[in-house]
Every structure is written in structure tokens, then in C-alpha cells.
């Protein structure tokens, strides 16, 4: 779970160790603060959870670049 | 204002070492930035070397800097750049930069003026 | 790793200039920054965030893009416009190889 310390700044300290389908993911986004220990991904799934990752595991990157994809193709 | 300078460059030999610091004013370190090392071969592009964070020092480097460069907050507004086994490929301006804010997507809003580094036998 | 193209472009004053710059995997839609350098000078950054401004940077300077595909452009064209520009992603802090772009030198007649 992503832990927010003096917000906004929110940081990973762990990472799932489960791949998640791109199915059920809606959103993510990139934890880059020099305030935090690691650098991540928190992923945000269809029912609102919030999971950090290991922006080094290529799922993780897959599944940034699917939803990317998904961002930048217009739903018609 | 705020104000990176970079100083320590100079001629060395090829397996020589330096170490360069850069100073800040005008801001403290307990604003929470990252703070990198950039260089610059005559005529060439940027290369990013090495990040630290002002606030809790963690440490980034690029490949081919690892185990040969180590960057390192020396004090509340300087930050160093430890060189060994320099080689001719070394010889750069090293710029000293600092994020705009705590996030590494927002670029580097403060830059140094450089400091020459000159790798010759 | 960061592809800039092209290398070089000249352009006339009041033109309008556009540099591309290709990410070799995706790094979404807001995470690069767009230098402008002059000889003898440091970087100074224009763009953030793929297209925020810089604090006091003319809004002649447009960035946009997402994935792996993002622009500059540089309309009205002045003669200070000479420089050599510069991307850099801002996706990853991990991976600080080939951050910058090679970078595209612009030349105003």
C-alpha cells in the first residue's frame, strides 16, 4: 500500500510481488520524489486500489505502455 | 537568487582522480530536490551522470558511471563528484543541476556554469 | 534511450521550426523536458511535463506529445532562437543512460 507522508508526497517502501492483468488496471502513475527511498509505479485498478510496483520488472513496464496506449487511443 | 556553482575542474593524467563540488545558495538541501551531475565533451551532447537527494540521499547513476563516479552530499548545500580512473573519454564540462521541485519529471530550473574538466597525458 | 531528429535545421526569421524526439519504449504523456543551450552557456530549460512552460519562457515555445513521439515547435522564429535543443525524459530516475536527447542545433538566417 502506497503510504503518504507529509502529503501530498506519496511513497513506496514495498512492492507487490503478484502481476496483475492489464484488465484490471485503470491508471497509474510514477513516483519519482527525491523524498522517497524507491522509485515506483502505483497502479490504480478498476475498483480504486491503489498498488505500488517495481518500475524495473517488465510487466510493470507493459503494463505502463498498455495503458498508455489506451490513454492516447480515443474511445469511440 | 539561487545559485549552483560548480568548481574543482582542472588538467589531470588518465587514471588520475578529482573530485568536484557543487555549492548551492540561496536555497537549502531541507527542500527536497535532485540534485545531478551532467557533463558535456567538447562539442557533444548532455550525459547525465548521477542524482542524489538533497533530503534523504538516495542514489542514482547512470551505468557506465557506477563504481567509478560516486556522488555524495557533503553538507547542507554542497554535493560532490568523486572521479577515478579518469580517461581522455572524461574530458567534459560537468554542470552541476538541480530539479524544480522534488519530482524528477519537472527538469532541471537551476543549473551551475560549469567547471572544464581536461583529461591529458 | 532518447532520439533526436534532425540534427541540425535552418530556418529564417519568423519561421516556424519543429524537432522531434523519439523515446525507445513508452514514457507516457507528461514526462519530458524540452533545453534550449547556447555556446558557452548551461542548458536553460523551456518545457516541462511534455508541455508546461517554463517560468518566463515565451509561449512561442510549444511542446506536446505522448508514448514515445514528442515535439517541439518553435513559431515567429527570433534570431536569440539559435541554439541547440535538447530533450530529456522524465519518466524514470533509475535509468539515467541516455536521458538527454543528441540534440538539434538551429541555425536563424
Known amino acids: 500500500q502506497p503510504d503518504a507522508i507529509n502529503a501530498p508526497v506519496t511513497c513506496c517502501y514495498n512492492f507487490t510481488n503478484r502481476k496483475i492483468s492489464v484488465q484490471r488496471l485503470a491508471s497509474y502513475r510514477r513516483i519519482t520524489s527525491s523524498k522517497c527511498p524507491k522509485e515506483a509505479v502505483i497502479f490504480k485498478t478498476i475498483v480504486a486500489k491503489e498498488i505500488c510496483a517495481d518500475p524495473k520488472q517488465k510487466w510493470v513496464q507493459d503494463s505502463m505502455d498498455h495503458l498508455d496506449k489506451q490513454t492516447q487511443t480515443p474511445k469511440t | 537568487q539561487e545559485q549552483l556553482v560548480e568548481s574543482g575542474g582542472d588538467l589531470v593524467k588518465p587514471e588520475g582522480s578529482l573530485t568536484l563540488t557543487c555549492t548551492a545558495s540561496g536555497f537549502s538541501f531541507s527542500t527536497s530536490y535532485w540534485m545531478c551531475w551532467v557533463r558535456q565533451a567538447p562539442g557533444k551532447g548532455l550525459e547525465l551522470i548521477a542524482c542524489i537527494s538533497s533530503s534523504i540521499g538516495v542514489t542514482y547513476y547512470a551505468s557506465w558511471a557506477e563504481g567509478r563516479f560516486t556522488i555524495s552530499k557533503t553538507s547542507s548545500t554542497t554535493v560532490t563528484l568523486q572521479m577515478t580512473s579518469l580517461t581522455v573519454a572524461d574530458t567534459a564540462t560537468y554542470f552541476c543541476a538541480r530539479t524544480t521541485d522534488d519530482n524528477w519529471n519537472v527538469g532541471f530550473n537551476l543549473w551551475g556554469p560549469g567547471t572544464l574538466v581536461t583529461v591529458s597525458s | 534511450d532518447m532520439t533526436q531528429t534532425p540534427a541540425s535545421v535552418e530556418v529564417g526569421v519568423g519561421g516556424t521550426v519543429t524537432i522531434k524526439c523519439q523515446a525507445s519504449q513508452s514514457i507516457g504523456n507528461r514526462y519530458l523536458s524540452w533545453y534550449q543551450q547556447k555556446p558557452g552557456q548551461p542548458p536553460k530549460l523551456l518545457i516541462y511535463g511534455t508541455s508546461t512552460l517554463a517560468s518566463g519562457v515565451s509561449s512561442r515555445f510549444k511542446g506536446s506529445g505522448s508514448g514515445t513521439q514528442f515535439t517541439l515547435t518553435i513559431s515567429g522564429v527570433e534570431c536569440a532562437d539559435s541554439a541547440t535543443y535538447y530533450c530529456?525524459?522524465?519518466?524514470?530516475?533509475?535509468?539515467?543512460?541516455?536521458?538527454f536527447g543528441g540534440g538539434t542545433e538551429v541555425v536563424v538566417k
Open positions: 530529456q525524459q522524465g519518466a524514470t530516475i533509475s535509468y539515467l543512460d541516455n536521458a
